[in-house]
């Protein structure tokens, strides 16, 4: 089992949005997955997903996940506030044959405020 | 309504093999959720010891899983424990009871127990 | 292993008293947790899961809060048939594990 997150860094206006991407890749086929996404160390959410269906669509505040099978888990923050700043990192586990879990590394969100006298650009970087 | 039933002999001997059955009534175990096997020993708390899913995959509890077999008999809407090598702290009360797959792992329906001692 | 601690272990109170069990995680379980009502030689009975959603059938006067380590199980006005043993689960972390379990008796 691995994940592979992104950005490693994004740089959002306060009220846009922020798109983080989970891809779990696992060898074997698997009947569920659990996935769980953090901010700063604290679980935002943890859906499960069986037969390509997750099992919640709300993640956090203003939190929004949708899964495109065979592997791509996205949380959508809309609209972004201050709060929403912090370190996010996705974590997968199945349990069936043999429990396997791992997890990405950190997408870093920088929140701007909306404060036009700012005139900051964003970023995004993706590993790779 | 879903009911399920423990079976099996009340009295196994160290060293032997424990066999417990779970009959499901009311729900083919073959649709959807998880069905388990939980333990509790005498006055104490509830242990998870494993389930099989509604697609036939076991899992386990790592603290048990080189002695325990979990399977099901689909025709006659059954699940079954085996834990091999019992001693006397395998002695309690085991449920079976069933989680929602899906959505978690919080059990919403059980057995009334059955109660395995270990004893020569 | 994520290890879940009730307090009090033991309890003792009246018919319409307001009661609250806690239960602490030994690591951050999100709203993962289960709360069982268990009365002598029955099985557990499912109560709350995802912290605070009440079963199907569940008395209001039976509540769950909490997230992340910290989980509290109240019960509004104490009922004679409450008098039993509550449990807490966690199933965020593998294996699944429950609390000690909190006694509630008549006073």
């Known amino acids: 089992l691995s994940v592979q997150q992104g950005p490693n860094l994004l740089q959002v206006r306060q009220g846009s949005q922020a798109t983080l991407v989970c891809q779990v890749d696992q060898a074997t086929a698997w009947e569920r997955l659990r996935v769980k996404w953090t901010k700063d160390g604290a679980i935002l959410c943890q859906p499960y997903i069986t037969n390509g269906s997750l099992s919640l669509g709300v993640c956090g505040p203003q939190g929004r996940l949708s899964w495109q099978a065979p592997s791509h888990l996205t949380l959508q923050l809309d609209p972004v506030s201050l709060n929403h700043s912090g370190a996010y990192v996705c974590w997968a586990a199945v349990e069936i044959p043999e429990l396997e879990e791992a997890e990405g590394n950190i997408t870093r969100l920088f929140v701007d405020p909306d404060d036009p006298t700012q005139n900051r650009n964003r970023i995004a970087s993706f590993p790779g | 309504q879903v009911q399920l039933q423990e079976s099996g002999p009340g009295l196994v001997k160290p060293s032997q093999t424990l066999s417990l059955t779970c009959t499901v009534t009311?729900?083919?175990?073959?649709?959807?959720?998880?069905w388990n096997w939980l333990r509790q020993h005498p006055g104490k708390g509830l242990e998870w010891i494993g389930y099989i899913n509604y697609a036939g995959s076991s899992s386990y509890n790592p603290s048990h899983k080189s002695r325990v077999t979990i399977s099901r008999d689909t025709s006659k809407n059954q699940f079954f424990l085996k834990l091999s090598s019992v001693t006397a702290a395998d002695t309690a009360v085991y449920y079976c009871?069933?989680?929602?797959?899906?959505?978690?792992?919080?059990?919403?329906?059980w057995g009334q127990g059955t109660t395995v001692t270990v004893s020569s | 292993d994520i290890q879940l601690t009730q307090s009090p272990s033991f309890l003792s109170a009246s018919v319409g008293d307001r009661v609250t069990i806690t239960c602490k995680a030994s690591?951050?379980?999100?709203?993962?947790v289960a709360w069982y009502q268990q009365k002598p030689g029955k099985a557990p009975k499912l109560l709350i899961y995802?912290?605070?959603t009440r079963h199907t059938g569940v008395p209001s006067r039976f509540s769950g809060s909490g997230s992340g380590t910290d989980f509290t199980l109240t019960i509004s006005s104490l009922q004679p048939e409450d008098f039993a043993t509550y449990y807490c689960?966690?199933?965020?972390?593998?294996?699944?594990?429950f609390g000690g379990g909190t006694k509630v008796e008549i006073k």
């Open positions: 689960q966690q199933f965020s972390g593998f294996p699944w594990t």
């Open positions: 690591q951050d379980v999100g709203t993962a």
């Open positions: 009871a069933r989680s929602n797959y899906r959505n978690d792992d919080a059990m919403d329906s």
């Open positions: 995802w912290a605070s």
């Open positions: 009311g729900y083919s175990i073959t649709s959807d959720f998880a």
